[in-house]
Interface confidence: low
């Protein structure tokens, strides 16, 4: 037999319940048999009513949700903050890379600058969009950059005697760029570096954003009625007996929580794999898999590719002169 | 070595950033994130224990509540009795995960698959295809991970430029203005402009 309620008038229970639910009409004046109770099954007279029980269940589930939110708060903040920081950092890297590339053109090839700035800007805009998940092909981005640059290099540096560039010769030069491998293996090299580094960067950001989604979903889990009943028994049923100061047993709490969280704990295996896979990805993010390293070094590779064109300028001018003769003649008329 | 443009910014603009004691790179920041995430590796399996430890539980009291009655904290009744005549706890576990939980698991499965396919094979940072592009062995050390270019005039060498400074302080204020490489000014530990070495005639 449990000790009799210390307060024969349910006064303590009423004052506690008032904090949960203003309006005292649900609390009996004196202990009652409580035959209608479904959760806090009484072993004797009780200070609880069916309505109180329902309120306790609701409160227990709310408590549980709040505890869950506080449990995930630090983790959630960690991922949200880092996802934002990295996204901003990657945007800054792209902006610097664009500035470095523009500077290289301005300082070394001033005659190319107005158009080069435009092509470089378009390329790095595509890079940003790709990182954020756009459906753009990296090889196409790189090809477009070199396809656009070559006509300008040819007409401004290699054959400056030509009249203002016209679509005809530009199209011919764009074609010649690929056919004659005008830039050597540099475009392929840049494709490899850029696609590898951007792919990894994109997945890294995707993984962080998915981490946020997972924690957000965990945060808003709704617990079943069965769980609500278990929590009510654990946290509130003692009040019905007037035992206001008593706390649940530790082992009992663990059993209840494991019951309530049986589904949630199943996430554990996949969550572990997520962190370990992310670690593996991060460990590999260096050299050509590090977009910072690759993008900020791009301008020097582009510079070298233009030098390569210049070194082979004599032969190229002759070959292109023949290949695009038709277009050039049409231009002169 | 990689060539850097000579003039740092239009109008010789100077970029100065308050000195940060521990210079951070993006990669160090990534590693730091992973270390912190690893401290949450048991997040889901530890949730029941976390919630019990953050809700009122009898710790120093002699008596505690087991769901039905007041019992001694170390008695067998402390864990078991409260569960009698209740709905079946085993049944609760056997119901299978909630739809929301299944949704979380599916999302994690998907990203894990992506992460696995993207993970860089250990010790193989540069693809064979790149080796065949004419990268000369020896020019870049033991492995050719450092080489990221080849042409008649030698290798292109990349250095990580961006110092990932605390709170992303390092930012250019000229967007379309050409930039250059920053050097740490050795006198005042601020990043300032300086002439790059190696300019074409």
């Amino acid at each position: 037999q449990p000790p009799p309620p210390p307060d024969a008038t349910c006064h303590q229970v009423r004052s506690f319940f008032q904090r949960l639910q203003p309006g005292l009409k649900w609390v009996p004046e004196t202990p009652v048999p409580g035959s209608d109770l479904q959760v806090c099954l009484p072993k004797g007279p009780t200070c609880c009513s069916r309505k109180m029980e329902e309120k306790y269940q609701l409160t227990a589930r709310l408590n549980m949700e709040q505890l869950l939110q506080s449990a995930s708060m630090e983790l959630k903040f960690l991922i949200i903050q880092n996802a934002a920081v990295f996204q901003e950092a990657f945007e800054i890297v792209v902006r610097h890379a664009k500035n470095y590339t523009n500077a290289m053109f301005k300082n070394n090839y001033p005659s190319l600058t107005p158009q080069a700035f435009e092509f470089v800007g378009e390329f790095f805009t595509d890079v940003s969009l790709y990182i954020l998940g756009s459906d753009i092909n990296v090889d196409d981005m790189v090809n477009e950059l070199f396809d656009s640059l070559f006509p300008v290099i040819y007409t401004q540096m290699m054959n400056p005697g030509l009249p203002e560039s016209v679509l005809d010769i530009n199209e011919c030069l764009r074609g010649a760029r690929r056919d004659l491998k005008v830039f050597g293996s540099f475009p392929k090299l840049i494709m490899t570096q850029v696609s590898k580094s951007l792919q990894v960067t994109r997945i890294f950001l995707q993984a962080l954003n998915l981490g946020i989604e997972v924690i957000n979903t965990t945060d808003h889990l709704k617990f079943s009625k069965d769980c609500g009943r278990m929590l009510t028994r654990m946290w509130y049923c003692s009040y019905c007996q007037g035992l206001m100061m008593v706390k649940p047993c530790g082992g009992y709490c663990n059993v209840v929580m494991q019951g309530c969280m049986a589904g949630v704990v199943e996430i554990d295996k996949y969550w572990r794999e997520y962190i370990l896979s992310l670690e593996e990805l991060v460990n590999g993010m260096y050299r050509i898999y590090d977009m910072e390293n690759v993008l900020l070094g791009l301008f020097s590779t582009i510079h070298d590719s233009i030098q390569y064109v210049q070194k082979n300028g004599g032969k190229l001018t002759t070959t292109i002169g023949k290949l695009c003769a038709h277009s050039q003649q049409r231009q002169y008329r | 070595s990689a060539y850097y443009p000579e003039d740092l910014f239009i109008d010789k603009k100077i970029l100065k950033v308050a000195h940060v004691e521990h210079e951070e790179t993006l990669s160090s920041r990534r590693r730091e994130l992973i270390q912190k995430l690893k401290s949450f590796i048991n997040f889901y399996s530890a949730l029941p224990g976390y919630i019990c430890s953050h809700s009122p539980v009898a710790e120093n009291d002699t008596l505690c509540w087991n769901g039905q009655e007041l019992v001694e904290r170390y008695s067998q009744k402390a864990a078991r009795n409260g569960m009698k005549n209740q709905f079946n706890l085993h049944e609760l576990k056997m119901k299978g995960p909630e739809p929301v939980v299944s949704q979380i698991i599916d999302k994690l499965k998907h990203i894990n698959q992506l992460l696995r396919t993207m993970s860089v094979p250990k010790g193989k940072v540069l693809d064979k295809s790149l080796d065949e592009e004419g990268l000369e062995s020896g020019d870049c050390g033991d492995d050719e991970d450092e080489c990221i270019g080849s042409s008649g005039d030698g290798m292109v060498k990349v250095k990580n430029q961006l110092r990932f400074l605390a709170e992303l302080a390092y930012d250019l204020d000229v967007d379309d203005a050409p930039g250059n490489k920053q050097h740490g000014n050795q006198k005042d530990n601020e990043i300032t402009t300086s002439h790059s070495v190696g300019n074409m005639p």
Epitope: Y286, R287, N293 | S1, A2, Y3, Y4, E23, T25, S27, D139, G141, D142, D145, E146, D153, G154, M155, K157, K159, N160, R163, K181, H183, G184, Q186, N189, S194, H195, S196, V197, G198, N199, M200, P201
Partner: antibody
Framework: QVQLQQSGTDLARPGASVKLSCKAS????????ISWVKQRTGQGLEWIGE????????YYNEKFTGKATLTADKSSSTAYMELRSLTSEDSAVYFC????????????WGQGTALTVSS | DIQMTQSPASLSASVGETVTITCRAS??????LTWYQQKQGKSPQLLVY???TLAEGVPSRFSGSGSGTQFSLKINSLQPEDFGTYYC?????????FGTGTKLDLK
Amino acid sequence: QVQLQQSGTDLARPGASVKLSCKASGYTFTSFGISWVKQRTGQGLEWIGEIYPRSGSPYYNEKFTGKATLTADKSSSTAYMELRSLTSEDSAVYFCAKDFGSSYVFDYWGQGTALTVSS
Amino acid sequence: DIQMTQSPASLSASVGETVTITCRASENIYSYLTWYQQKQGKSPQLLVYNAKTLAEGVPSRFSGSGSGTQFSLKINSLQPEDFGTYYCQHHYGTPPTFGTGTKLDLK
């Protein structure tokens, strides 16, 4: 002020390995490359290779691949060079030198470590 | 690798004189050339980079010139502290190579 402090004189047996150190101070160690240069008695200078402290990536002169291994410890701002399978040809003064910035121009040098390989 | 050849191999001069040391590269290195001074038992000191830019703290009596494959270092009004060995070095890609050295001693 910038300083590169190298380890003291070293004596080693043929076939052995030796690890020389170069402790940097007065600047951000991870921002600049550290090169190693060999000078045999009464002879010119030879570039061995360079280490990028931030990534720990080495970059060797082909001639010294397999002979030298360059490493760096960010926490102590120290660069290391290990020389293996030593022969009398490796007897020399070895300098570490800091990159000026974006090219192989060396603005600060260590005092040098004299290595003698003798049986 | 690019070969760097210095001439003369040695040179004697007096304080107050003007001397010129030359350096030739086996291929075009544009302006990617550096000059160092080394005194007996000491480490080299940077004098000039980019063929003609004087390093910080280097007296103006030193001047560098040239581009492509031919370079020279001129020292006006020699001072006692100027005696030692001078090395040129290209920084046009890897590996950077040094010249054979020019020993400047007191006549």
